[in-house]
């Protein structure tokens, strides 16, 4: 005996109470594949979540975070509080970056300033809580009498993007 439910398209469910008729998903529910015997309840974007995309009969809702928060996890499963640049979020709330570290975003942790001397360079611009240091030419390049046929290319540490 052929299962009539396999004919039910996405956006419907196979209603056993009505001789396996394909019924539309009720409001606030969806079925993203055909042949389903129930529709799934739509995700509700409440509290710190706001609706980015409403649920349709074939796809679930998608949420964003309200102002002052940002998404974490797959499909924005959590909202985490924003901090200011120059801060990081701790269990006790937003705290300023310790000396020698910086954070140029509203999320994430404070990261250590680049150590210019490891690359044989000097500090051109000091770091702050919000910005990394800017490394310049090595001290030797700046000494009197040092000359070069071509100016040195701007150096960049591997794995570091320019600020």
């Amino acid at each position: 005996l052929q299962d009539l439910c396999s004919n039910c398209p996405a956006g419907t469910f196979c209603d056993n109470n009505r001789s396996q008729i394909c019924s539309p998903c009720p409001p606030n529910s969806f079925s993203s594949a055909g042949g389903q015997r129930t529709c799934d309840i739509c995700r509700q974007c409440k509290g710190v979540f706001k609706t980015r995309k409403e649920c349709s009969s074939t796809s679930n809702a998608e949420c964003d975070c309200i102002s002052g928060y940002h998404c974490l996890g797959a499909e924005c499963s959590m909202c985490e509080q924003d901090c200011k640049q120059g801060q990081e979020l701790t269990k006790k709330g937003c705290k300023d970056c310790c000396f020698g570290t910086f954070n140029d975003q509203k999320r994430g942790i404070c990261r250590p300033w680049t150590n210019c001397s490891l690359d044989g360079k000097s500090v051109l611009v000091n770091g702050t809580k919000e910005r990394d240091v800017v490394c310049g030419p090595s001290p030797a390049d700046l000494s009197p009498g040092a000359s070069s046929a071509t100016p040195p290319a701007p150096a960049r540490e591997p794995g570091h993007s320019p600020q």
């Epitope: 956006g11 539309p24 009720p26 409001p27 606030n28 739509c42 609706t51 980015r52 995309k53 409403e54 649920c55 349709s56 009969s57 074939t58 796809s59 809702a61 998608e62």
Partner: antibody, heavy 116, light 107 residues
Amino acid sequence: QVQLQQPGAELVKPGASVKLSCKASGYTFTNFWINWVKQRPGQALEWIGNIYPGNDNTNYNGNFKTKATLTVDRSSSTAYMHLSSLTSKDSAVYYCARGQLGLDYWGQGTTLTVSS
Amino acid sequence: DILLTQSPAILSVSPGERVSFSCRASQNIGTTIHWYHQRTNGSPRLLIKFASESISGIPSRFSGSGSGTDFTLSINSVESEDFADYYCQQSNSWPFTFGSGTKLEIK
């Protein structure tokens, strides 16, 4: 800010058809349902149906299934409702409204007059 | 279709008074009820969603309660701008339906 813009009025003859428009702005058009609601003078609101612009899902009130056809033009972020075989009973204000369940933003409404 | 009955058809109150609107559903609809008001010659405006959830930008004097079949919208101190028609709407099942409305008028 979210806005739904509708023409103020339409005058059509009995037996003819009309296509009412609802231009959306201030949000991602394809992510939110558009509903159509009828209100005759001095009467209550009557839900006609809705359409999801992201994939053209539609739901209709059975009373309007042969009367109304809902479509969208994604390129212009505009929803349309085509009303056919018009009679004097179709004279009303027609609103478009955004929302999957509760309708959070409404157009100003189009006053449709069916008269010879 | 789910029938929503609003009573009374007309409510007469003075500014500053507390007022409550009733909406009764013909079957259990959980909390899938939403409230609107509509001023003369204006578009409806969402006041409360899902029976009791507040809406951004709506004054705190508006509140909602109820579940199942009986729902109430309250205004704790009516202001002049609140005199309008009030409608409930259900989103529990297709088709969505509205109540017949209650007119709030000045006593």
